[in-house]
Amino acid sequence: LKGQEFAPSHQQVYAPLRADGDKPRAHLTVVRQTPTQHFKNQFPALHWEHELGLAFTKNRMNYTNKFLLIPESGDYFIYSQVTFRGMTSECSEIRQAGRPNKPDSITVVITKVTDSYPEPTQLLMGTKSVCEVGSNWFQPIYLGAMFSLQEGDKLMVNVSDISLVDYTKEDKTFFGAFLL
Amino acid sequence: LKGQEFAPSHQQVYAPLRADGDKPRAHLTVVRQTPTQHFKNQFPALHWEHELGLAFTKNRMNYTNKFLLIPESGDYFIYSQVTFRGMTSECSEIRQAGRPNKPDSITVVITKVTDSYPEPTQLLMGTKSVCEVGSNWFQPIYLGAMFSLQEGDKLMVNVSDISLVDYTKEDKTFFGAFLL
Amino acid sequence: LKGQEFAPSHQQVYAPLRADGDKPRAHLTVVRQTPTQHFKNQFPALHWEHELGLAFTKNRMNYTNKFLLIPESGDYFIYSQVTFRGMTSECSEIRQAGRPNKPDSITVVITKVTDSYPEPTQLLMGTKSVCEVGSNWFQPIYLGAMFSLQEGDKLMVNVSDISLVDYTKEDKTFFGAFLL
């Protein structure tokens, strides 16, 4: 019974001491996206590189078919950056034509899918109106936060327009998660 | 069978239980930049405050000559924010003069230097076109992600134009890393 | 001398081994803000949801009256995203009227309050000029970094204009912290 003095006895049960180096972790990097079917009103999911270059998955965190699979329940820090790039936005064209200024937008959503729950859960959203004056524009949206996930949960990154995603370099567009 | 020692069963070896408080960590904050020589086509590196105010380095994570030195191999979360500020961008001036709209841009790169590899590795990049209408503009670029680093690796933050960096406050422009 | 096998003997003293699952953690999400008195020249603080939806506090990290209370000294990763939205900015109106282009701005500050110190400390600031051409604009500001906090410290998120904060969805505007 020695050692119980350091903490409530229940803690050994749900959160035993463990080596940090064996925690599930992943950093995924952008690759060229192949256009895929997606439902109207549903943002398409990005697919990712998971072992070449800076990308890796380790300690039972697996990547398959656009999803990061959570192998163990716990609190995870999840992050993503998507760099968008485009030509003059529609807003700019509309403005020049003297019509109402409805801005375009770019959006990134990190989504959780739980088999036992019918609807995906949006964990994080970054959304920005784009009403650029220059002929070419580019900009990143960064997201990151901590969430309690369950074993078997799946994470994906959805974007408003897959054709605007900058896939040219692994340091510009990425997605990761690690167990705290 | 040489080399097998590095695979799965190894985890107790390279990642024993250890106190979280003794992990390498640093948070560096902005200082006024002194203009320095840098190669054409190579972004200049920022230098940082490492012990005054909010800044600190601890547990063998050292800062020297614009670099954070990684004292121990492992997975690190690395982050930086750079706040840029400027006068009306060239893009805006060009637009008024009726010339083509080539936008200016601002870029932050977190770079890794490994002595055993000739080329620096770009870990993270945030890049944004700047085509502002107002006479003065300012905006941050934030980056953060997890990377597997080796003992002896060096990290730095490079920017596209050092003269646009807002060095007025330690909370606006910063750079940090911690072992997970 | 039992236990020395796990780590250098000094570690037991200042940072005992502890289960990751019992570390103070919180993720707070946006709710509709009620207009409150705040001093001129002082940004108003946001209040937050702390237990419904994605929001949670755990392991003695408590939320009360706009503040996250730090229950234990150590190094914390602190983050927030605030999504702003507005109509055509004043800058745009000013420009059309031919007056000088003083841009509007949006600002987020993560502030630390320490009872033993009279002034709040600004830990993180994200500030951006807003000079949009479109009639409606929206955009996030994200912040995140590591800080050494003391037991009893209080954290809050302040914004330049509470009426511009998008409180419609818990994934758009949030605030969190966790002990490393």
Partner: antibody, heavy 123, light 111 residues
């Protein structure tokens, strides 16, 4: 000494299949990206496919996508290229080449090449 | 049509200096990806000549050098020798193709 030895080439009719092999020696095979590169008679080099060290990531040139499959057996230090629905324009010498480690994939060249195996697609 | 553009042929007399250019785009060389050069002697497999824009593998004479700027790269050979007569290929990574790309090759003739 590092060596790559290709085999499996030959004459095949259009629409047919062939499986190329490349046996590696002299280096830690599983630590390196491997690739297939081909050279049509009198023409230049054309990259065909690449595979990561563990085999989990694969990429293909558009000209062979959906018809060719790259794979590896790290226990046998062997790289494979399964070629289906072959066409006359697939006629070439096929080289197996060693790339860099997974980490430097985007930035490394091919530092070791096999001697090549000839594939002829003709009726 | 190759993704990277090289001149089909160059020539020079023994002892002279020749350069071979390699022009790419914003999805390969211009994106910051390294350029590598290969030498293919008649009837043999290609051999790595320059890696990472300007580095020579051991055994490659210092008469061979590489450089890169913007969306293009070049290979320089000084003190030309008859045994340098070969085909030379540049190669890089191309993000829009998710793979490696080669130039069309340049035949070097030593006069």
């Amino acid at each position: 000494e590092i060596q790559l030895l290709e085999s499996g080439g030959g004459l095949v009719q259009p629409g047919g299949s062939l499986r190329l092999s490349c046996v590696a020696s002299g280096f830690t095979f599983s630590s390196y990206v491997m690739s297939w590169v081909r050279q049509a008679p009198g023409k230049g080099l054309e990259w065909v496919s690449v595979i990561s060290g563990s085999g989990g990531s694969t990429y293909y040139a558009d000209s062979v996508k959906g018809r060719f499959t790259i794979s590896r057996d790290n226990s046998k230090t062997t790289l494979y290229l399964q070629m289906n629905s072959l066409r006359a324009e697939d006629t070439a010498v096929y080289y197996c080449a060693k790339g860099g480690t997974n980490y430097y994939y985007y930035y490394s060249g091919m530092d070791v090449w096999g001697q090549g195996t000839t594939v002829t697609v003709s009726s | 049509q190759s993704v990277l553009t090289q001149p089909p042929s160059v020539s020079g007399a023994p002892g002279q200096r020749v350069t071979i250019s390699c022009t790419g785009s914003s999805s390969n060389i211009g994106a910051g990806y390294n350029v590598h050069w290969y030498q293919q002697l008649p009837g043999t497999a290609p051999k790595l000549l320059i890696y990472g824009n300007n580095n020579r593998p051991s055994g490659v004479p210092d008469r061979f050098s590489g450089s890169k700027s913007g969306t293009s790269a070049s290979l320089a050979i000084t003190g030309l020798q008859t045994e340098d007569e070969a085909d030379y290929y540049c190669q890089s990574y191309d993000s829009s193709l998710s793979g490696w790309v080669f130039g069309g090759g340049t035949k070097l003739t030593v006069l």
